[in-house]
């Protein structure tokens, strides 16, 4: 069976690394697992891995905003950020605001890596399974 | 035959869902028919399906911009929004200004669904081949 | 053996095409050749092409920004704009301001075509190998 | 900047015909829909219908049960609006408009072309 | 067609006031998304101006002290501190559907 997942935005995520629904909606979770917002990898090869957030607020301030996916293997001490997107200065002072973060690439993942999502602001994030969501397929 | 799409922007239309050229540049359509701006998925499997579309105006005034896939089925009474991209405050007031919405990512899709893409503003598109497009690949 | 290619940023680059890294890191480099800038196909056939700029700056001036994929071959006497994203008025004068441009997509490549990136201005592009980077890989 | 000029002033019979034309420059035309507006002496906005001129579509206000007619000139970035079989009632301020496609909101006005139906 | 009703026909304030317009539509004219109504200006021998676009968006060059709110069938016009350039007629439009239709206008005068 094709190794994919399609995991939409979780609005009660509390803390990073975001946490995702993969049960409902337009979920695709197959020959991955998910464990508490990590996508483990348990075939060695190569991956596209991309996600997309939707960061929006009432009152623009223009806090940095940063979105990364990284990896973390347990033969590794530190976590490995693959891929990232930053946003300074993107709105007019004071007006409701929104925009995207969109990353996406193909990358030699081991088996036991895991997979994660981290946002600068997580408060700022709009979870609509349509605007935040994060997946990879095998090649 | 690979099931492939690669779509580009087509001025002359005023309708939504916005309508594509899909016979000359540097389209591709193979084991995928187009009708009326949408893909029609003959044969179910996980697919790949992205968008981009590039938004311009001569002078700002902030317009939300939304840029959507969407799919219907006949089975189904709505349409489901499978990938938003939202913009609100993105511009100096005044200035010419121009941005793209990105989207791309993994559904399982079902024979006969009919996949499109919608914007808010059809007056600020840009269809130049290269900025705006809309294409899907089967895993 | 599957042809794929994740090249990074690479900060020396002085000149356009940009140039990238091809050896260390997070890369990928299989059935595909890297030649000054460029990647290079060996064998005829679709492939998914993908590439993220990240541009930043100290003071925002609001200068037009474009990230162009092209492909050059020596059959064809101009190059073909494949993909393309570009930014006006993405920020507020005189603020320290960051932003980036996602491009990706199916084309029908032939053996021996040339792949490239271009940015407007080369001066505001960060290199982390994270931010921006050059890849594709054959469906 | 974007500009829309209007004709001039004109005076008609009842039962004729009024041809107005209004001149667009400062902005891709085919991109934009034009529409019709009119104002009848201390009354309020009336539309009348839309062009789009990038395909040459248009709709039209049923009020009018037919007797408008609008069109463009590509090649002249000028759209036209004729109505027929005048009565007085018809006696307004035309106005063109440019509007977005799909907010439908009237960016850019013409300076309005005043037309007198009058025996 | 959708009916626009705004009121009061006329409203008379002092400059430096605040001025409050309303307009009804006969149904609604939201989506998910926007709520498809736009408000202009106009004062004699001059076209309309557009103010407000999607019920609450300020058109470039257009003082912030015009403000626009509502959704569904009732939506607000707020001028916060009237100036004497603002005295004139305010219409408001929907979009929605065919046919557009506007309301059937607001006369700002002065107290």
């Known amino acids: 069976l094709r190794k994919v997942a399609h995991l939409t935005g979780k609005s009660n995520s509390r803390s990073m690394p975001l946490e995702w629904e993969d049960t409902y909606g337009i979920v695709l979770l197959s020959g991955v697992k998910y464990k508490k917002g990590g996508l483990v990898i348990n075939e060695t090869g190569l991956y596209f891995v991309y996600s997309k957030v939707y960061f929006r607020g009432q009152s623009c301030n223009n806090l940095p905003l940063s979105h990364k996916v990284y990896m973390r293997n347990s033969k590794y001490p530190q976590d490995l950020v693959m891929m990232e997107g930053k946003m300074m200065s993107y709105c007019t002072t004071g007006q409701m605001w929104a925009r995207s973060s969109y990353l996406g690439a193909v990358f030699n993942l081991t088996s036991a890596d895991h997979l994660y999502v981290n946002v600068s602001e997580l408060s700022l994030v709009n979870f609509e399974e349509s605007q935040t969501f994060f997946g990879l397929y095998k090649l | 035959l690979r099931k492939v799409a690669h779509l580009t922007g087509k001025s002359n239309s005023r309708s939504m869902p916005l309508e594509w050229e899909d016979t000359y540049g540097i389209v591709l359509l193979s084991g995928v028919k187009y009708k009326k701006g949408g893909l029609v998925i003959n044969e179910t499997g996980l697919y790949f399906v992205y968008s981009k579309v590039y938004f311009r105006g001569q002078s700002c005034n902030n317009l939300p911009l939304s840029h959507k896939v969407y799919m219907r089925n006949s089975k189904y009474p709505q349409d489901l929004v499978m990938m938003e991209g939202k913009m609100m405050s993105y511009c100096t007031t005044g200035q010419m200004w121009a941005r793209s919405s990105y989207l791309g990512a993994v559904f399982n899709l079902t024979s006969a669904d009919h996949l499109y893409v919608n914007v808010s503003e059809l007056s600020l598109v840009n269809f130049e081949e290269s900025q705006t497009f809309f294409g899907l690949y089967k895993l | 053996l599957r042809k794929v290619a994740h090249l990074t940023g690479k900060s020396n680059s002085r000149s356009m095409p940009l140039e990238w890294e091809d050896t260390y890191g997070i890369v990928l480099l299989s059935g595909v050749k890297y030649k000054k800038g460029g990647l290079v196909i060996n064998e005829t056939g679709l492939y998914f092409v993908y590439s993220k700029v990240y541009f930043r700056g100290q003071s925002c001036n609001n200068l037009p920004l474009s990230h162009k994929v092209y492909m050059r071959n020596s059959k064809y006497p101009q190059d073909l704009v494949m993909m393309e994203g570009k930014m006006m008025s993405y920020c507020t004068t005189g603020q320290m301001w960051a932003r980036s441009s996602y491009l990706g997509a199916v084309f029908n490549l032939t053996s021996a075509d040339h792949l490239y990136v271009n940015v407007s201005e080369l001066s505001l592009v960060n290199f982390e190998e994270s931010q921006t980077f050059f890849g594709l890989y054959k469906l | 900047q974007v500009q829309l000029v209007q004709s001039g002033a004109e005076v008609k019979k009842p039962g004729s015909s009024v041809k107005v034309s209004c001149k667009a420059s400062g902005y891709t035309f085919t991109r934009f829909d034009i529409s019709w507006v009119r104002q009848a002496p201390g009354q309020g906005l009336e539309w009348m219908g839309w062009i789009f001129p990038g395909d040459g579509s248009s709709q039209y206000n049923e009020n009018f049960k037919g007797r408008v007619t609008i069109t463009a000139d590509k090649s002249t970035s000028t759209a036209y609006m004729e109505l027929s079989s005048l009565r007085s009632e018809d006696t307004a301020v035309y106005f063109c408009?440019?509007?977005?496609?799909?907010?439908?909101?009237?960016?850019?006005w013409g300076q309005g072309t005043l037309v007198t139906v009058s025996s | 067609e959708i009916v626009m009703t705004q009121s009061p026909a006329t409203l008379s304030v002092s400059p430096g006031e605040r001025a409050t317009l309303s307009c009804r539509a006969s149904?609604?004219?939201?989506?998910?998304?926007?709520?498809?109504i736009h408000w202009y200006q106009q004062k004699p021998g001059q076209p309309p101006r557009l103010l407000i676009f999607l019920a609450s968006h300020l058109e470039s060059g257009i003082p912030a002290r015009f403000s626009g709110s509502g959704s569904g069938t009732e939506f607000t016009l707020t001028i916060s501190s009237l100036q004497s350039e603002d005295f004139a007629v305010y219409y408001c439009?929907?979009?929605?559907?065919?046919?557009?239709?506007f309301g059937q206008g607001t006369k700002v005068e002065i107290k």
């Open positions: 439009q929907h979009s929605r559907e065919l046919p557009r239709t």
């Open positions: 408009a440019r509007s977005l496609i799909s907010t439908a909101m009237f960016d850019h």
């Open positions: 149904k609604s004219v939201s989506t998910s998304d926007f709520s498809y």
